[in-house]
């Protein structure tokens, strides 16, 4: 006999990276008929929701109106149908960004590179941090971690046209508190000598999304957030 229900799916809307003082919604999707959802933060009960009518609702939302470092951390949720509880969801790492300072990002040999060359991103932040994160915008969001006193190197390559895209870096004060994002660096990769055409870029967020990623949920972020979250959060762990 089944002792637990399938685990629910947890995510953050519009994004798991939340600028401080902005709002975020944590969503938990379980099953129709669930009478209670519990949101846990860092292992302790954080919030409860009892959907009405339960048979018509399979998802609840927990609203955080004002993000700060105390709200950043690992969230999970569970739900109950009758007396039977579900398995806990995967962990959601909620990150507060725009803390303290803005790093600078440079790329070597430059923003326009040739397929086959090796590329190094350098991220620098003078305030006290030792961990840096390099993020590539887009559907197949790549996140790299680097370490250094004030600067970290992120080697890439040999590059292909798949490396094309917009990169930003963050300084990380801990796993869940990140700096402001750096200015973007757009990496262009031309083909080899025989084929100098540029391949299509990875599907990316609309151009204005990054700066307003907490102000709208109508930019296509909703469709991509699960992929982004999964990649980035595996890295966080």
């Amino acid at each position: 006999q089944q002792q637990t229900l399938p685990k629910p799916f947890i995510w953050a809307e519009p994004h798991f990276m939340v600028p401080k003082e902005k709002q975020v919604t944590i969503c938990c999707q379980g099953n129709y008929g669930a009478v209670e959802y519990q949101l846990h933060f860092e292992g302790s009960l954080f919030a409860v929701d009892r959907p009405k009518p339960p048979e018509r609702i399979n998802k609840v939302k927990f609203y955080i109106p004002d993000m700060n470092s105390r709200m950043a951390g690992q969230y999970s949720c569970i739900y109950r149908v009758g007396e039977l509880w579900s398995e806990p969801s995967n962990l959601l790492d909620l990150v507060v960004t725009e803390m303290y300072d803005t790093p600078t990002l440079s790329v070597h040999p430059g923003p326009e590179v040739i397929s086959g060359e090796k590329v190094t991103f350098y991220c620098r932040l003078d305030t006290a941090t030792s961990m840096f994160l390099l993020l590539k915008e887009g559907r197949s969001s790549h996140v790299q971690r680097g370490y250094g006193k004030v600067q970290a190197e992120f080697p890439l390559g040999p590059v292909t046209t798949a490396h094309r895209g917009t990169y930003r870096c963050f300084g990380s004060y801990n796993n869940h508190a990140w700096s402001f994002p750096s200015e973007p660096v757009k990496l262009l990769v031309t083909g080899d000598i025989e084929n100098t055409s540029l391949a299509p870029e990875d599907p990316t967020f609309p151009a204005d999304t990054w700066g307003t990623y907490l102000l709208t949920t109508e930019t296509g972020l909703q469709k991509d957030h699960a992929l982004w979250d999964h990649t980035a959060q595996n890295l966080l762990r």
């Epitope: 600078t104 430059g110 086959g116 350098y122 190197e153």
Partner: antibody, heavy 115, light 107 residues
């Protein structure tokens, strides 16, 4: 066209420091890396480090950490390498080179360390 | 650090001859390799970048190629001004490193 102007030569005393300059023109100074390299008489080239004038990000060959400090003055489009505690081993030609792929090279400055 | 082993260290050849210089990389550097030419007065000029791309203004007799971890500079028909020093340089992984150089002498 791109020009990287370096002083021809400089004579310094052992134990002293020297600041070598590389004045750039013909391109946007803040958009390209600036590298420095050393060549001892009759020897090959060694990379000292590089700096990005826009971000101030610099990176050094471990061998030259504590010996060389790279800086830039964006207002005059000039890059500098500061060499400290000079010994006869530091007598060499020092080159600046523009761009991540070392696109263009200065003519080099000959540093002679002698009492 | 990546070692760049350049060979030969010196080479005697005749005008009109075809010669090849080689650099072997100790680690993968992709196509991040330059060939530089140094005149007797110390002037350095880049000839080839990204393994095989010819710089503008460089004569077509110069060409670059790669076979695995071996990178070659070929001069198809030597002219008098080619008898100078040549260096390879990898810019794949910091610290960027140079080959030991090849002195090309006239026979």
């Amino acid at each position: 066209q791109v020009q990287l102007q370096q002083p021809g030569s400089v004579l310094v005393r052992p134990g002293a420091s020297v600041k070598l300059s590389c004045k750039a023109s013909g391109y946007t100074f803040t958009s390209s890396w600036m590298h420095w390299a050393k060549q001892r008489p009759g020897q090959g080239l060694e990379w000292i480090g590089h700096i990005h004038p826009n971000s101030g990000i610099s990176n050094y060959n471990e061998k030259f950490k504590g010996k060389a400090t790279l800086t830039v003055d964006t207002s005059s489009s000039t890059a500098y390498v500061d060499l400290s505690s000079l010994t006869s081993e530091d007598s060499a030609v020092y080159y600046c080179s523009r761009g991540g792929r070392f696109d263009d090279w200065g003519a080099g400055t000959t540093v002679t360390v002698s009492s | 650090d990546i070692q760049m082993t350049q060979s030969p260290s010196s080479l005697s050849a005749s005008l009109g001859e075809r010669v090849s210089l080689t650099c072997r990389a100790s680690q993968d550097i992709g196509s991040s390799l330059n060939w530089l030419q140094q005149e007797p007065d110390g002037t350095i000029k880049r000839l080839i970048y990204a393994t095989s791309r010819l710089d503008s203004g460089v004569p077509k007799r110069f060409s670059g190629s790669r076979s695995g971890s071996d990178y070659s500079l070929t001069i198809s028909s030597l002219e008098s001004e080619d008898f100078v020093d040549y260096y390879c340089l990898q810019y794949a992984s910091s610290p960027w490193t140079f080959g030991g150089g090849t002195k090309l002498e006239i026979k």
